[in-house]
């Protein structure tokens, strides 16, 4: 079953390469187990950036080596992606799956264009 | 008389606060005197950023204290805005006027969204 997912159109990464955005899914009821996946689309290729399954009311847990962290509140997931470089500029799509209880619901956002600018290197200290 | 003006939808300022974009106007004939104005729209307010009048084939000359510089080639104007800070993020609109010979033509672009990220300060050298 299809589900509406909202996310901001544009986000700027900080000069430290950190970008945060909210992914909100409009469910007709309260799910207990939710899976959130961040996909990156660039040059018509889609790759998975990170994913987490969480029980509503609990923290999102990404893999230890993931570049993503997040928190949830109701149907809103606050996602943070770190370690971004200018070459990572692209469309970051939020995919939400209601895993439990059945039936399964799937929602895919329109994507958040994340712009990343590499900082100028600091001058060497003498 | 109306005239079509094209400019990019989005530009990222460099970490040094410099943003460049091309403003191209589709003139029905060959003008000899052209005026280019950059307007900034933010929070429904429009302010003038800079302006220059130039003779085609010559350099654009902005005022000495202007944050803009530019070059022209045919019907294209290469504009550079410097000294930008994060608070200067906004929609920068290119306005082109064909001043001579008559008739007068006016064209206004859809605007270029310039995103600016302030750099992290470099650590103090001991």
């Amino acid at each position: 079953k299809a589900m509406h997912v909202a996310q901001p159109a544009v986000v700027l990464a900080s000069s430290r390469g950190i970008a945060s955005f909210v992914c909100e899914y409009a469910s007709p009821g309260k799910a207990t187990e939710v899976r959130v996946t961040v996909l990156r689309q660039a040059d018509s290729q889609v790759t998975e950036v990170c994913a987490a399954t969480y029980m509503t009311g609990n923290e999102l847990t990404f893999l230890d080596d993931s570049i993503c962290t997040g928190t949830s509140s109701g149907n809103q997931v606050n996602l943070t992606i770190q370690g971004l470089r200018a070459m990572d500029t692209g469309l970051y799509i939020c995919k939400v799956e209601l895993m439990y209880p059945p039936p399964y619901y799937l929602g895919i956002g329109n994507g958040t264009q994340i712009y990343v600018i590499d900082p100028e290197p600091c001058p060497d200290s003498d | 008389k109306a005239m079509h003006v094209a400019q990019p939808a989005v530009v990222l300022a460099s970490s040094r606060g410099i943003a460049s974009f091309v403003c191209e106007y589709a003139s029905p004939g060959k003008a000899t005197e052209v005026r280019v104005t950059v307007l900034r729209q933010a929070d429904s307010q429009v302010t003038e950023v800079c302006a220059a009048t130039y003779m085609t084939g010559n350099e654009l000359t902005f005022l000495d204290d202007s944050i803009c510089t530019g070059t022209s080639s045919g019907n294209q104007v290469n504009l550079t805005i410097q000294g930008l800070r994060a608070m200067d993020t906004g929609l920068y609109i290119c306005k082109v006027e064909l001043m001579y010979p008559p008739p007068y033509y006016l064209g206004i672009g859809n605007g270029t969204q310039i995103y600016v990220i302030d750099p992290e300060p470099c650590p103090d050298s001991d």
Partner: antibody, heavy 119, light 106 residues
Framework: QVQLQESGPGLVKPSQTLSLTCAVS?????????WNWIRQPPGKGLEWMGY???????NYNPFLKNRITISRDTSKNQFSLKLSSVTAADTAVYYC????????????WGQGTLVTVSS | DIQLTQSPSSLSASVGDRVTITCKTS??????MAWYQQKPGKAPKLLIY???ILQPGVPSRFSGSGSGTDYTFTISSLQPEDIATYYC????????FGGGTKVEIK
């Protein structure tokens, strides 16, 4: 298309037990969703009574908890309501409806059946 | 328990008018708000869920908004077929309904 249909006696005597059944077609009640009973006294608003989930677990309105039982017959793809020790205040149109999740919006409803409590 | 206060309890408006109904909850419900239309002798019909999402087939003149404890249901241009009673429902904790708003034509 999912359809729900309530059935049961239209008249129940005070102190007796009200029994209604909701037959579901177009979707298996064990495949998903929660299956609810909602009632509406004449000229008044809607009151959620309780549900049975796809997995057989129940949740009831705390105000009715000691009088209500919702069960199911998976072989007939139907679920039932029993409300004990009824009084005239239980006179209402009784609806069955479906919602997603632990709590949720009711997307499919039965047409309702009027139950009058009177001697 | 979460209490819902729906207002007004009834209203009269002309065809083409903008109609607004509000629903206030006793605590933050995280946008878990639904709106229903009920015509006389019929079962309620789900119009909107999760505060603002229209059910398939529901006309776009119906809309919902809100967050926290304050929610609004709007009919942008009242039509004769919109004569009904409208109910809000929260589904953050239990399923509870507002008292209803009866909409009539002037």
């Amino acid at each position: 298309q999912v359809q729900l249909q309530e059935s049961g006696p239209g008249l129940v005597k005070p102190s007796q037990t009200l029994s209604l059944t909701c037959a579901v077609s177009g979707y298996s009640i064990t495949s998903g969703y929660s299956w609810n009973w909602i009632r509406q006294p004449p000229g008044k608003g809607l009151e959620w009574m309780g549900y049975i989930r796809f997995d057989g677990n129940n949740n009831y309105n705390p105000f009715l908890k000691n009088r209500i039982t919702i069960s199911r017959d998976t072989s007939k793809n139907q679920f039932s309501l029993k409300l004990s020790s009824v009084t005239a205040a239980d006179t209402a149109v009784y609806y069955c409806a479906r919602n997603y999740g632990t709590w949720g919006a009711m997307d499919f409803w039965g047409q309702g059946t009027l139950v009058t409590v009177s001697s | 328990d979460i209490q819902l206060t729906q207002s007004p309890s009834s209203l009269s408006a002309s065809v083409g008018d903008r109609v607004t109904i509000t629903c206030k909850t006793s605590q933050d419900i995280n946008k878990y708000m639904a709106w229903y239309q009920q015509k006389p002798g019929k079962a309620p019909k789900l119009l909107i869920y999760y505060t603002s999402i229209l059910q398939p087939g529901v006309p776009s003149r119906f809309s919902g908004s809100g967050s926290g404890t304050d929610y609004t249901f709007t009919i942008s241009s009242l039509q004769p077929e919109d004569i009904a009673t409208y109910y809000c429902q929260q589904y953050d904790n239990l399923n509870t309904f507002g008292g209803g708003t009866k909409v009539e034509i002037k």
